[in-house]
């Protein structure tokens, strides 16, 4: 009754990507999905969690260079910690310097991902589209 | 000496995507890569062919819905056939109706892909970024 029941042979010149949830985008062994429906940050986070994923975490311009091509702006998993003034990801890690250009669009403690590695600060209650991400092991 | 030397077990709840050239985007078992360097249409086509791929072919809004998120514009594999006035892909197939909104930006016989399934007509000699695509079997 194992869940693992498919055997696949892969040519060395090419490679499979994943595994990812069905119909998600796979890139450099990370899984991404863009959700069209607008939700506030908390609802967006819950939606990603329900799919065994988290909101987008930007950790590498090289490994995630597909993000520079994304149009519009979407919730990501970056939140402001008022007590120490830092920006951190859902997993508790701190935003690395020079990864994102943070633009204070509005008063808020959440951030939208905007193309070319920009982060737009916004009120967490504002509905927006969002990006979920699942890192493969 | 077989090229096929990796055996992978895949959980039924998730799936692998591909196979694709290393570090390409995989989505719904198609492979995509966005190239930053600007080339004219012919050079772009040659670049894709050298990687065992072709310029982007848009064949399904559902299977290729990731394309609606792409910002800017990039050469795709669509060319105008002056003799019969039709638009066709590199493989000789005719552009399906309602797949792309064709916008006559310039006089030309080649087309750029622009977000939300638009095709911008452009002179084939103009340098632009481009999208290569490889369909998996």
């Amino acid at each position: 009754n194992s869940l693992f029941n498919q055997e696949v042979q892969i040519p060395l010149t090419e490679s499979y990507c994943g595994p990812c949830p069905k119909n998600w985008i796979c890139y450099k062994n990370n899984c991404y999905q863009f959700f069209n429906e607008s939700k506030n940050w908390y609802e967006s986070q819950a939606s990603c969690m329900s799919q065994n994923a988290s909101l987008l975490k930007v950790y590498s311009k090289e490994d995630q260079d597909l993000l520079k091509l994304v149009k519009s702006y979407h919730w990501m998993g970056l939140v402001h910690i008022p007590t120490n003034g830092s920006w951190q990801w859902e997993d508790g890690s701190i935003l690395s310097p020079n990864l994102l250009t943070i633009i204070e669009m509005q008063k808020g403690d959440c951030a939208l991902y905007a193309s070319s590695f920009k982060g737009y600060i916004e009120n967490c209650s504002i509905p927006n589209t969002y990006i979920c991400m699942q890192r493969t092991v | 000496n077989s090229l096929f030397n990796q055996e992978v077990q895949i959980p039924l709840t998730e799936s692998y995507c591909g196979p694709c050239p290393k570090n390409w985007i995989c989505y719904k078992n198609n492979c995509y890569q966005f190239f930053n360097e600007s080339k004219n249409w012919y050079e772009s086509q040659a670049s894709c062919m050298s990687q065992n791929a072709s310029l982007l072919k848009v064949y399904s809004k559902e299977d290729q819905d990731l394309l609606k998120l792409v910002k800017s514009y990039h050469w795709m594999g669509l060319v105008h056939i002056p003799t019969n006035g039709s638009w066709q892909w590199e493989d000789g197939s005719i552009l399906s109706p309602n797949l792309l909104t064709i916008i006559e930006m310039q006089k030309g016989d080649c087309a750029l892909y622009a977000s939300s399934f638009k095709g911008y007509i452009e002179n084939c000699s103009i340098p632009n970024t481009y999208i290569c695509m490889q369909r998996t079997v």
Epitope: K71, S72, Y73, I103, E104, M105, Q106, K107, Y120, I121, N123, I126 | K71, S72, Y73, A114, S115, S116, K118
Partner: antibody
């Protein structure tokens, strides 16, 4: 270079209708929300309506709700404002504007004058 | 809908600093943006968000916010800065609507 060119303004009687157009060029039109803002002669600016890049979401000021309809044709790179049941207080220069981000409008057209008078 | 209040007119000596203010309940929750409009011309965005300037806007323009008040400061006003200035914000009752202040006429003496 971003350009926005409004047209369709003119003189119309109270209760009448008018359709304004705004032809856009120099940017990927469908990627941006667009707005209409008006300015009565000698008065300040008043936000009228906005529409998302896809055209799927539309928003209106209370003063025009139910009378005006905003729309867009992304294949023609054109924004529209259909104005029905016009009143004297709708007399204004109507500007179309490209949204940089939500309420921030970074490019404006030169405007078209709508005069509602009998 | 919410309202934004601006002083109708402000004057400044050439080269001096002037502050134009905008008050409204919505400004407790949202940043204002500021538009410059010269006679017979379309408005131009000069400040948005906390204190962001679009490209081409001189750095003598800056924005700030405190409580229910937003401010536009011009440090070293130039003759070409003479214009009407409008603040703008999201409506506090509907995030999808926005509202302009009545405008401030700036005269550079």
């Amino acid at each position: 270079e971003v350009q926005l060119l409004e047209s369709g303004g003119g003189l119309v009687q109270p209760g009448g209708s008018l359709r304004l157009s705004c032809a856009a060029s120099g940017f990927t039109f469908s990627s941006y929300a667009m707005s209409w803002v008006r300015q009565a002669p000698g008065k300040g600016l008043e936000w009228v309506s906005a529409i998302s890049g896809s055209g799927g979401s539309t928003y209106y000021a209370d003063s025009v709700k139910g009378r005006f309809t905003i729309s867009r044709d992304n294949s023609k790179n054109t924004l529209y404002l259909q104005m029905n049941s016009l009143r004297a207080e709708d007399t204004a220069v109507y500007y179309c504007a490209k949204e940089l981000y939500r309420e921030y409008m970074d490019y404006w057209g030169q405007g078209t004058l709508v005069t509602v008078s009998s | 809908s919410s309202e934004l209040t601006q002083d109708p007119a402000v004057s400044v000596a050439l080269g001096q600093t002037v502050r134009i203010t905008c008050q409204g309940d919505s400004l407790r929750s949202y940043y204002a943006s500021w538009y410059q409009q010269k006679p017979g011309q379309a408005p131009v965005l000069v400040i948005y968000g906390k204190n962001n300037r679009p490209s081409g806007i001189p750095d003598r323009f800056s924005g700030s916010s405190s409580g229910n008040t937003a401010s536009l400061t011009i440090t070293g006003a130039q003759a070409e800065d003479e214009a009407d200035y409008y603040c703008n914000s999201r409506d506090s009752f509907s995030i999808h609507q926005n509202v302009f202040g009545g405008g401030t006429k700036l005269t550079v003496l």
